[in-house]
């Protein structure tokens, strides 16, 4: 009987899917200088692998395209019944394509008050990301950077000292009380004020030097 | 033998309502459209309703149409005929009877004994 | 809706005779022309279908023919068992329609 290990060694192995991977293992490419490796791939091995991804990606696009078909099956047959025509004769089957008829101007009208309703909310939508532009266009906005920081570093340099109690939200969630709102408005106020305080270099180094 | 027995009927007075039922076998129920079909005491045959073989169609003549409703329970091998604002006009015998067609034309061709419905006040 | 109306509402004749009954349509429904049976206990059933095929089970002295309005169910050998009232039926449009009936009497 044959060992079923010693069959598998010597079949040629497939190539592992290759592996996504995320744009910062990229980073360093970019940033340090390396020299370039000689590839230990033959050509032919190469065009091995490549027809090997290429079938891969195939059969996934045929699987998807089945899937999207029996959705699509599953769909219509949950909205369209099937016809049940034994018994019927030609009498029936002219009244019930009128019904089908009627049924399909009933769905007509009804596509359309929703159309009509969907362009209203579009328009509206539009209005209002429009007045969203508008508004932010009244404000000075700084320019930003990318900067590595820590989130409680972030969170001393936003609310100062208040920075360790604002950590525990939910405890500090539960003492708010009807009175505070008052209070809390003032806050946001402040806090926005911070903000622009630090806007550009020179406001945050003062910050951080504190 | 293709068999059908029809129950339900009975005296009510104008506006009442009532439920018919036929009990079917001797055949597969759920391939067939069924029927309904009264007999007025004058002796006139009238058409009253039919329904498709899975009961997602059913035709009415205008008649009866929005007071009675034909339905079927296919795992029961029954048909329904649920009759509401019934007027004195309605009063008749009631056959249950199953469809068949031939070329386009349909007819009806196993009947029941009948079911008797008399409205009056 | 069509209107199916019979020549006459009741026939007499001896058994053993041949018989005639005629039914018309108000309009053209392309053989799609029923004949039922009711007996004098109320039980009915159905003899021709489509102009002139015989149902299963019935008698060949039975046969239909006609076509567009005019239609006729003829009865060759009159029996006893054949005394009862004949209904034509078209199922060309809804509502289905019945003539009035015609009775069959003996002479």
């Known amino acids: 009987m044959a060992d079923g290990s010693s069959d598998a060694a010597r079949e040629p192995r497939p190539a592992p899917a290759p592996i996504r991977r995320r744009s910062s293992n990229y980073r360093a490419y970019a940033t340090e200088p390396h020299a370039k490796k000689k590839s230990k791939i033959s050509a032919s091995r190469k065009l091995q692998l490549k027809t090997l991804l290429l079938q891969i990606a195939k059969q996934e696009l045929e699987r998807e395209a089945e899937e999207r078909r029996g959705e699509k099956g599953r769909a219509l047959s949950t909205r369209c019944q099937p016809l049940e025509l034994a018994g019927l004769g030609f009498a029936e089957l002219q009244d019930l394509c009128r019904q089908l008829h009627a049924r399909v101007d009933k769905v007509d009208e009804e596509r359309y008050d929703i159309e009509a309703k969907v362009t209203k909310n579009i328009t509206e939508i539009a209005d209002l990301t429009q007045k969203i532009f508008d508004l932010r266009g009244k404000f000075k906005r700084p320019t930003l950077r990318r900067v590595r920081i820590s989130a409680d570093a972030m969170m001393q340099a936003l609310l100062g000292a208040r920075a360790k109690e604002s950590l525990d939200l939910r405890a500090h969630l539960k003492q708010v009380k009807k009175e505070d709102t008052e209070k809390e408005n003032r806050e946001v106020g402040d806090w926005r004020k911070n903000i622009d305080a630090l806007s550009g270099m020179e406001g945050r180094k003062k910050k951080f030097e504190s | 033998e293709v068999q059908m027995v029809e129950s339900g009927g009975g005296l009510l007075k104008p506006g009442g309502s009532l439920k018919l039922s036929c009990a079917a076998s001797g055949f597969t129920y759920s391939n067939y459209a069924m029927s309904w079909v009264r007999q007025t005491p004058e002796k006139r045959l009238e058409w009253v309703a039919t329904i498709s073989s899975g009961g997602s169609y059913s035709f009415y003549p205008d008649s009866v149409k929005g007071r009675f409703t034909i339905s079927r329970d296919n795992a029961k091998n029954t048909l329904y005929l649920q009759m509401l604002s019934l007027r004195s006009e309605d009063t008749a015998m009631y056959y249950c009877?199953?469809?068949?067609?031939?070329?386009?034309?349909?007819?009806?061709?196993?009947w029941g004994q009948g079911s008797s419905v008399t409205v009056s006040s | 809706d069509i209107q199916m109306t019979q020549t006459s509402s009741s026939l007499s004749a001896s058994l053993g005779d041949r018989v005639t009954i005629s039914c018309r349509a108000s309009?053209?429904?392309?053989?799609?022309l029923n004949w039922y049976q009711q007996k004098p206990d109320g039980t009915i059933k159905l003899l021709i279908y489509?102009?002139?095929r015989i149902h299963s089970g019935v008698s060949s002295r039975f046969s239909g023919s006609g076509s567009g309005t005019d239609y006729s169910l003829t009865i060759s050998n009159l029996e006893q068992e054949d005394i009862a009232t004949y209904f034509c039926q078209q199922g060309h449009t809804i509502p289905l329609t019945f003539d009035t009936g015609t009775k069959l009497e003996l002479k």
């Open positions: 309009q053209e429904i392309t053989n799609y």
């Open positions: 009877a199953r469809r068949d067609n031939y070329y386009g034309s349909s007819f009806m061709d196993y």
């Open positions: 489509y102009t002139s």
